[in-house]
């Protein structure tokens, strides 16, 4: 019968920081030089031996004379209570198939971590424990005096625990949060009655959870160095270096090389010249509490991130073409680069791709003259595209070209005795058609009745009009815009010898907020188009003169511009242009984009005052310079009489007072006889014009007293 192999020499040591018990023991009576599979059962009690808190089995192969080791981590800080440990064993080896039985228990080993020294009456544990956010933590207090009432607070809020014995209470903190990097404070206060006997506190260091590095990537720009980057996520550093920021290590499995990175989000790896093409990197993030890693496997030639191109230049720049050249940093022989060119100008962007070896060249065509362009280039590995380099760019300006379009020209012809005064207007060419800076305009005036006679007027830019005094002949006028390169096509208009201002009835039109909608009858015969011109009715024509060209098949147009102002009257003239470029006035129109009420009232004179009547007149009142078409006048009359005079009707004024009102519907009727009056009576009147938008401003009434019947005025 075999002897039971009882564990002996059980020794227990502690690690307060880890809250762990470390057991060491040996097995007696083990046959010399023999190995046996054995099972050890371990029992752990707290406070007293009968209070078993943990039982577990540990299986291992045991050699003769071997010292066995096993560790156990306690949730409760070891300082909080005395622990007891014992152990027994069982042979579980195929070499001994007969029924096996457990050995006796070893004697209990008592484990006590004494940190409750000094004259203090209260202790709180654990000291400066480091845990990860979201974990469960157990803390405790030990009170020397069981008469004391002890309250504990986590960040100032009271917590409640479980009494383990009269001196010890434990608190289970579930899923502890990160509060601050200087730790979470917990303190306990012992008191008798209302008198504090003392307070003890601890700092619990809660670390944020270490994240797996994100976006891990490596690339090379020169086949000498790999530049690896990643997003480290949250920094898990704690105050007072209780836990430094997480460290990052690169490990390459093919070479077996390892490098501790000095930056938190990037690391450089030297490429050895041993033609290693494939790399398998593991990036390991590590803090005191855990490790996280992420892996990438790649071929070096597939991870080329080129340095940006350099020496960007432009050669043979003319008005519409240029050659763009650039250089790339050569990184390997027979390397093909794919380059992308972006051309920005005139609000447009063009993109071109080109394959190159060392030096890049691209022919930029169909450019606009006299235009500043920004061209930039970036390159990548053409064989295994990984990513584009940064851009390299430069500005250049194309040369000027002759203006490509004739100026838009119009005129006003006024008849003077014996001649025509022609005021010529032109619009500046758009940038697209000017092809450079316009320096001057040539105006060529040719007498069609005397073909040999012509005059040239050179007008410096930026002038946009000129006045010509011509006799009663027909004239052809050409306007040409000139820049440093050349002249534009000519714009031609013809002034006929016949007076063009034949009587055309002016028609009133109503505008809208959007502008004016105009239509006209087509001109008989061939026309090459129509011109609508307009200006402010009350101003000098030259100040606000505009025109619009309309095609030959169109007999209506909308004139809309922000320049139209409410209360301003605009005059429109519509001309037909014959094939000989002679303008014929077809229609005249006038109107307001928005009518307003009259801005002033007439100055009224009282005439022929008799005992029974008086005459009101306002002959000087101009209906032309008003902010709307005057439609007539309202005459207001007040008297002591209850009834209104014939033709007058009752009205209520804005101040609520009553009076009599007479309406005149003819704006040119500027007088009124008020009769059927009583002698020696007091009357008040007030006259205001009205437009479609309302009456003129309210004003004071004028007083009139009729004389007695015997007086003569």
């Amino acid at each position: 019968e075999r002897l039971p192999l009882t564990p002996v020499s059980l020794k227990v040591s502690t690690n307060s920081t880890r809250q762990s018990l470390h057991l060491q023991w040996t097995v007696h009576n083990l046959p010399y030089h023999q190995e046996l599979k054995m099972v050890f059962q371990i029992q752990i009690s707290r406070i007293e031996t009968s209070n078993v808190i943990w039982v577990g089995n540990y299986s291992t192969t045991v050699k003769w004379n071997q010292v066995l080791h096993w560790s156990w981590e306690s949730e409760l800080p070891l300082e909080c209570a005395t622990h007891f440990v014992r152990i027994k064993s069982l042979v579980d080896d195929a070499k001994f198939p007969e029924p096996n039985f457990w050995s006796n228990w070893s004697s209990w080993e008592e484990v006590s971590v004494q940190d409750s020294t000094g004259q203090d009456i209260l202790f709180v544990f654990p000291k400066d424990k480091l845990v990860e956010e979201g974990t469960n933590v157990t803390i405790c207090y030990v009170s020397r005096n069981i008469q004391n009432n002890v309250s504990c607070y986590l960040e100032g809020k009271q917590i409640h625990g479980e009494q383990l014995d009269p001196h010890v209470t434990a608190f289970n903190l579930n899923s502890v949060p990160f509060i601050r990097n200087k730790g979470t404070n917990i303190y306990c206060e012992a008191s008798q009655g209302n008198v504090s006997e003392g307070m003890k506190g601890i700092v619990l260091f809660v670390s944020k959870v270490l994240e797996e590095p994100k976006d891990f990537s490596c690339e090379t720009e020169d086949f000498k160095t790999l530049h690896c980057t990643w997003d480290p996520g949250t920094d898990t550093a704690l105050g007072w270096s209780k836990q430094p920021s997480q460290s990052y290590t690169l490990f390459e499995s093919f070479s077996g090389e390892k490098k501790l990175c000095t930056h938190k989000n990037w690391c450089n790896w030297q490429i050895t010249q041993d033609s290693q093409e494939t790399y398998n990197f593991t990036l390991i993030a590590e803090n005191y509490l855990r490790k996280r890693s992420v892996n990438i496997l790649f071929n070096l030639t597939h991870r080329v991130y080129l340095m940006n191109p350099f020496s960007v230049n432009f050669e043979n720049v003319n008005a519409t073409n240029a050659i763009m050249t650039w250089k790339v940093h050569s990184i390997r022989n027979n390397f093909t680069y794919l380059c992308q060119i972006e051309l920005h100008g005139e609000g447009k962007m063009m993109q071109y791709n080109v394959s190159i070896k060392v030096n890049g060249e691209y022919f930029l065509s169909e450019l606009e003259p006299a235009t500043e362009y920004m061209a930039r280039v970036r390159c990548a590995d053409a064989s295994h595209f990984w990513k584009w380099s940064e851009w390299s760019g430069q500005n250049f300006t194309t040369l000027e070209a002759a203006p490509s379009e004739a100026p838009d020209v119009w005129r006003i012809v006024s008849l003077e005795p014996g001649n025509h005064t022609v005021t010529l207007f032109w619009k500046p060419l758009s940038k697209l058609h000017a092809n450079g800076k316009i320096l001057f305009y040539n105006v060529v005036v040719e007498n069609l009745d005397k073909p040999s006679s012509s005059e040239l007027h050179s007008i410096p830019a930026p002038a946009n009009s000129t006045k010509l005094i011509l006799d009663r002949c027909s004239y052809q006028i050409c306007v040409i815009a000139n820049n440093s390169v050349g002249a534009s096509p000519a714009s031609v208009i013809v002034i006929s010898a016949d007076p063009e201002n034949k009587e055309v009835e002016e028609e009133r039109i109503a505008g809208t907020e959007g502008g004016f909608s105009l239509s006209w009858k087509p001109q008989p015969g061939d026309v090459i188009g129509y011109v609508v011109d307009w200006c402010d009715h009350t101003q000098d024509v030259l100040g606000d003169f505009q025109w619009k060209n309309v095609g030959p098949n169109t007999t209506s147009t909308v004139i809309s511009t922000d320049a139209f102002r409410p209360g301003v009257r605009y005059d429109f003239r519509i001309y037909g242009l014959s094939t000989k470029r002679i303008a014929c006035l077809l229609e005249k129109k006038t109107g307001y984009s928005q009518e307003l009420a009259p801005s002033d009232n007439p100055h009224v004179l009282v005439d022929t005052l008799t005992s029974h009547s008086f005459t009101l007149s306002w002959k000087d009142y101009s209906t032309e310079s008003q902010p709307g078409f005057i439609q007539g006048y309202h005459v207001y009359l007040k008297s002591k009489a209850r009834q209104c005079h014939p033709r007058f009707e009752k009205a209520v004024l804005s101040d609520g007072s009553e009076c009599c009102k007479y309406k005149i519907d003819n704006p040119e009727e500027k007088a009124l006889i008020v009769d059927n009056l009583k002698p020696e009576s007091f009357y008040e009147f007030f006259i205001t014009p009205f437009t479609s938008a309302g009456e003129g401003p309210s004003a004071t009434f004028t007083k009139v007293t009729t004389p007695d019947e015997h007086s003569s005025m």
Epitope: K127, G156, K182, V203
Partner: antibody, heavy 126, light 110 residues
Framework: QVQLVQSGAEVKKPGASVKVSCKAS????????INWVRQATGQGLEWMGW????????GYAQKFQGRVTMTRNTSISTAYMEMSSLRSEDTAVYYC???????????????????WGQGTTVTVSS | QSVLTQPPSASGTPGQRVTISCSGS????????VNWYHQLPGTAPKLLIY???KRPSGVPDRFSGSKSGSSASLAISGLQSEDEADYYC???????????FGGGTKLTVL
């Protein structure tokens, strides 16, 4: 009884240094953190920093970083605050004060100051 | 300029209740406990309230503290002439990594 006794008044020239002592009695010196607070005449209280007498660890207010050093001698239960490069605006009463909680830590946590020294007047004048 | 804001002065008549406010931010009062001190002329400050509303031994229950969000207040009921002193609020500031005080409130008993 529990008390903190500070060294006597000092008069210093601008640019000089001063070292103020604070002797603890009536309690276990290493169990409670020591704070230093100053108060200029007619002004409010200004915290300067802390020292853990057990570990010797210190922490200073940003304003005093590099100019103040807090030390201790546990064998005589005394804390010290030394301030260099003195200026006229450093003229104040300097207090040492014990934290109300005996914190089982090598570091620091502020719970409040329940025992104060009598104060040391430091005058900086040329 | 103090990190915590207190009214410079407060007053009351004997027997009255007086409240002194202390306002801060999320990094100080908003996330830490508050202490109150009082200081008689020519003496060291004395702790009056710790952990928002706890009184050390010897402090009468006429003194009480409270906190709401980023503000705290000290209430003194049954005002007495010996309560005439300077009152300071204090807390830890997570951003500044240090203890901060209010500018102080001078309490006058009329």
């Amino acid at each position: 009884q529990v008390q903190l006794v500070q060294s006597g008044a000092e008069v210093k020239k601008p640019g000089a240094s001063v070292k103020v002592s604070c002797k603890a009695s009536g309690y276990t010196f290493t169990s409670y953190e020591i704070n230093w607070v100053r108060q200029a005449t007619g002004q409010g209280l200004e915290w300067m920093g802390w020292m853990n007498p057990n570990s010797g660890y210190t922490g200073y207010a940003q304003k005093f970083q590099g100019r103040v050093t807090m030390t201790r001698n546990t064998s005589i239960s005394t804390a010290y605050m030394e301030m260099s490069s003195l200026r006229s605006e450093d003229t104040a009463v300097y207090y040492c004060a014990r934290d109300i909680v005996a914190a089982n830590t090598d570091y620091y946590f502020y719970y409040g100051m329940d025992v104060w020294g009598q104060g040391t007047t430091v005058t900086v004048s040329s | 300029q103090s990190v915590l804001t207190q009214p410079p002065s407060a007053s009351g008549t004997p027997g009255q209740r007086v409240t002194i406010s202390c306002s801060g931010s999320n990094s100080n009062i908003g996330s830490n406990t508050v202490n109150w001190y009082h200081q008689l002329p020519g003496t060291a400050p004395k702790l009056l309230i710790y952990n928002i509303n706890k009184r050390p031994s010897g402090v009468p229950d006429r003194f009480s503290g409270s906190k709401s969000g980023s503000s705290a207040s000290l209430a003194i009921s049954g005002l007495q002439s010996e309560d005439e002193a300077d009152y300071y609020c204090s807390t830890w500031d997570d951003s500044l990594d240090g203890v901060v005080f209010g500018g102080g409130t001078k309490l006058t008993v009329l």
